[in-house]
């Protein structure tokens, strides 16, 4: 009786179960009653990452330097190439098909997490007691100067964008 379903890593064709091709190989010819499935390796620029019956391998992703991309991990016959972005840039999507410059945190905001090749800068508002007076992709919020430790007093209060201004203590009492 011909099978109606096949085991894992097999497929049904012409009422018989044939082995799928292993990752890194493509289908050349189905199995027969006399022979196993004919599979052949993907070429150097191609891959297949699953047990399959594909007659063509997939092309490795091209990390286009014109789009700011570079190779993070070279593809094999079983894996695709992984692209990342050049210094100062990050991917626009999870599949990393193009890159954009990291954003800078505006004055009043500091860097919570520095950008990587795959993620953008994460900014956070400077809380009370901290400030940032620059637009930067690296600088965190800095604490206000402590006038007291310098034996000075606050002459001008700090904001999220400016440091406090310290001055000498009023000696007239």
């Amino acid at each position: 009786e011909p099978p109606t379903a096949c085991r894992e890593k097999q497929y049904l064709i012409n009422s018989q179960c044939c082995s799928l091709c292993q990752p890194g190989q493509k289908l050349v010819s189905d199995c027969t009653e006399f022979t196993e499935t004919e599979c052949l390796p993907c070429s150097e620029s191609e891959f297949l990452d699953t047990w399959n019956r594909e007659t063509r391998c997939h092309q490795h992703k091209y990390c286009d330097p014109n789009l700011g991309l570079q190779v993070q991990q070279k593809g094999t016959s079983e894996t695709d190439t992984i692209c990342t972005c050049e210094e100062g840039l990050h991917c626009t999507s999870e599949s990393c098909e193009s890159c954009v410059p990291h954003r800078s945190c505006l004055p009043g905001f500091g860097v919570k997490q520095i950008a990587t090749g795959v993620s953008d800068t994460i900014c956070e508002p400077c809380p009370v007691g901290f400030f940032s007076n620059v637009s930067s992709a690296f600088e965190k919020c800095r604490p206000w100067t402590s006038c007291e430790t310098k034996d000075l007093v606050v002459q001008q209060a700090g904001t999220n964008k400016t440091d406090v201004v310290c001055g000498p203590q009023d000696r007239q009492r």
């Epitope: 289908l27 010819s29 189905d30 022979t35 004919e38 052949l40 007659t55």
Partner: antibody, heavy 117, light 111 residues
Framework: EVQLEESGGGLVQPGGSLRLSCAAS????????VSWVRQAPGKGLEWVGS?????????YYASWAKGRFTISKDTSKTTLYLQMNSLRAEDTATYFC?????????WGQGTLVTVSS | DIVMTQSPSSLSASVGDRVTITCQAS???????LSWYQQKPGQAPKLLIY???TLASGVPSRFSGSGSGTDFTLTISSLQPEDFATYYC????????????FGQGTKVVIK
């Protein structure tokens, strides 16, 4: 029944052209490579070329066949073709089609091509 | 292109004999793409062995294939009357020239 049947052979003059057909039954060209092999009278087997699985299929040829011989297929009709141009006396042979590429699992009975004036 | 040289080109043997046919490649090759065929007069070839040593289903176990590098062997352990035929090796240069080549054949005749 799984089988291959060649047709289109015959007598042709030197310099002439001929198109051989290979009709498949019981299997699908979209998932099977197919090859052409020839055998001159009283001689050994000689690979002509192959076409890979898939709807279009990549083609591979023996160096002597490149440019003169063309393999194609019509997946919907499960028919394989061998277009032979600029035929010479030394192309006289029985032409077989066979399923597969690196190993040939099923063969037709062959069709005889005679190139003579 | 890789050249496959079979030897001997013909051999005389008797029923029950152990017969060895060799196929030598002009360069080292992958055994994955080496096959052996049997052809009887007036018939199409028949696949016996593929991947150098895998026996096609239905082929008697007296046939075996072995070898690596440049030297490959087809062995018939005990020759039977129906084994008198011509035998061919085939190699496909996959991944390089993609060309397939047959050996010139070995004819096994009755002594």
């Amino acid at each position: 029944e799984v089988q291959l049947e060649e047709s289109g052979g015959g007598l042709v003059q030197p310099g002439g052209s001929l198109r051989l057909s290979c009709a498949a039954s019981g299997f699908d060209f979209s998932t099977n490579a197919v090859s052409w092999v020839r055998q001159a009278p009283g001689k050994g087997l000689e690979w002509v070329g192959s076409i890979s699985a898939g709807s279009s299929g990549s083609t591979y040829y023996a160096s002597w066949a490149k440019g003169r011989f063309t393999i194609s297929k019509d997946t919907s009709k499960t028919t394989l073709y061998l277009q032979m141009n600029s035929l010479r006396a030394e192309d006289t042979a029985t032409y077989f089609c066979a399923r597969g590429y690196t190993y040939l699992t099923l063969w037709g009975q062959g069709t005889l091509v005679t190139v003579s004036s | 292109d890789i050249v496959m040289t079979q030897s001997p080109s013909s051999l005389s043997a008797s029923v029950g004999d152990r017969v060895t046919i060799t196929c030598q490649a002009s360069h080292s090759i992958s055994s994955t793409y080496l096959s052996w065929y049997q052809q009887k007069p007036g018939q199409a070839p028949k696949l016996l062995i593929y991947r150098a040593s895998t026996l096609a289903s239905g082929v008697p176990s007296r046939f075996s294939g072995s070898g690596s590098g440049t030297d490959f062997t087809l062995t018939i352990s005990s020759l039977q009357p129906e084994d008198f035929a011509t035998y061919y090796c085939q190699y496909t240069d996959y991944g390089s020239s993609y060309v397939s080549t047959f050996g010139q054949g070995t004819k096994v005749v009755i002594k």
